[in-house]
């Protein structure tokens, strides 16, 4: 058995920031489990975790440096990502696991949300920017 | 068969480390299954120390946690523990075990025996 | 954390006779009519092996004289007629929640 997820196929960053949510033909309600966000074709990159807990708070963290928070519902959890470059711009997967109580189970996988960053550069701006270059 | 066979115990000084190897045969440890590591202190029961996913993912006991590695090669269809910051009551004999579907330990190495003293 | 509390810690007992072990969890171990508590077998200097799981299904290889019935917190671990090769120490173990843990163990000694 195989959990199913359901992403919208493309998402939109205007202001360098959106919700992704990912969700899943599974309710979580008391389960414990590990969501987490991919990026790229090969979801290479781990752009961020949320581990639920039937005792704990949501654990939330990004070891790649992604400034991420996440929400959980009964079968989904959106993911919030801030602070997204222009280069950041590809394919996200939503990958969840329940490991407690068993069996285990994971998900299918996902068709993925294309997430198009077109907000701000956040790249610093010089405030004296010298002459462009042809 | 599956077979599970530990290696790399042996005396340690308090405040080091040590990396145990369980290396499996009869069964590819990448291919579905769950591998957890136990441990026993002499004359003691049986203490839970973590886990790996066939995912990848870990889980480790919250009173470990902060002082333990589980990891793998599947090339070499071996598991491995670290374990930090060694003290006495960490002296044990530590097993490698398969979780089947209903987390019931199903296969056990022989265990290998750590000892922490100076 | 579940605890899971084994009595009697010892008992001593003769070969053929019946021996009950029971195993009390501090919350149910239950989930979808499934109960998540394992019983294992430990002799000196040797690895536990694994005699039932899911409270009452008996491992392959493992003789008939073992059985384990129980739902929720309570179970019981039975020998039917004890063998020699019985006397070890066994173990509880449950798996519905992290971290996993054990039962303190009943050493079954010879009378």
């Known amino acids: 058995n195989k959990i199913l997820v359901k992403q919208s196929p493309m998402l939109v960053a205007y202001d360098n920031a959106v919700n992704l949510s990912c969700k899943y033909s599974y309710n979580l309600f008391s389960r414990e489990f590990r969501a987490s966000l991919h990026k790229g074709l090969d979801s290479a990159v781990e752009v961020c975790v949320v581990y639920g807990n039937y005792s704990q708070q949501l654990q939330v963290y990004s070891k790649t440096g992604f400034n991420c928070d996440g929400k959980l519902g009964n079968e989904s959890v959106t993911f919030y990502l801030q602070n997204l470059y222009v280069n950041q711009t590809d394919i996200y997967f939503c990958k969840i696991e329940v490991m407690y109580p068993p069996p285990y189970l994971d998900n299918e996988k996902s068709n993925g949300t294309i997430i198009h960053v077109k907000g701000k550069h956040l790249c610093p701006s010089p405030l004296f920017p010298g002459p462009s270059k042809p | 068969e599956v077979q599970l066979v530990e290696s790399g115990g042996g005396l340690v000084q308090p405040g080091g480390s040590l990396r145990l190897s369980c290396a499996a045969s009869?069964?590819?440890?990448?291919?579905?299954?769950?591998w957890g590591w136990i441990r026993q202190a002499p004359g003691k029961g049986l203490e839970w120390i973590g886990e790996?996913?066939?995912?990848?993912?870990?889980y480790y006991s919250p009173s470990l946690k902060s002082r333990v590695t589980i990891s793998r090669d599947n090339s070499k269809n071996t598991l491995y523990l670290q374990l930090n910051s060694l003290r006495a009551e960490d002296t044990a004999v530590y097993y490698c075990a398969r979780k089947d579907y209903y987390y019931a330990l199903d296969y056990w190495g022989q265990g290998t025996l750590v000892t922490v003293s100076s | 954390d579940i605890q899971l509390t084994q009595s009697p810690s010892s008992l001593s007992a003769s070969v053929g006779d019946r021996v009950t072990i029971t195993c009390r969890a501090s919350?149910?171990?239950?989930?979808?009519?499934?109960?998540?508590l394992h019983w294992y077998q430990q002799k000196p200097g040797k690895a536990p092996k694994l005699l039932i799981y899911?409270?009452?299904t008996l491992q392959s290889g493992v003789p008939s004289r073992f059985s384990g019935s129980g739902s929720g917190t309570d179970f019981t671990l039975t020998i039917s007629s004890l063998q020699p090769e019985d006397f070890a120490t066994y173990y509880c173990q449950q798996s519905y929640r992290t971290p996993l843990t054990f039962g303190q163990g009943t050493k079954v000694e010879i009378k």
């Open positions: 009869g069964y590819s440890i990448s291919s579905g299954y769950h």
């Open positions: 790996i996913y066939h995912s990848g993912s870990t």
């Open positions: 919350q149910s171990v239950d989930f979808y009519g499934k109960s998540f």
């Open positions: 899911a409270a009452s």
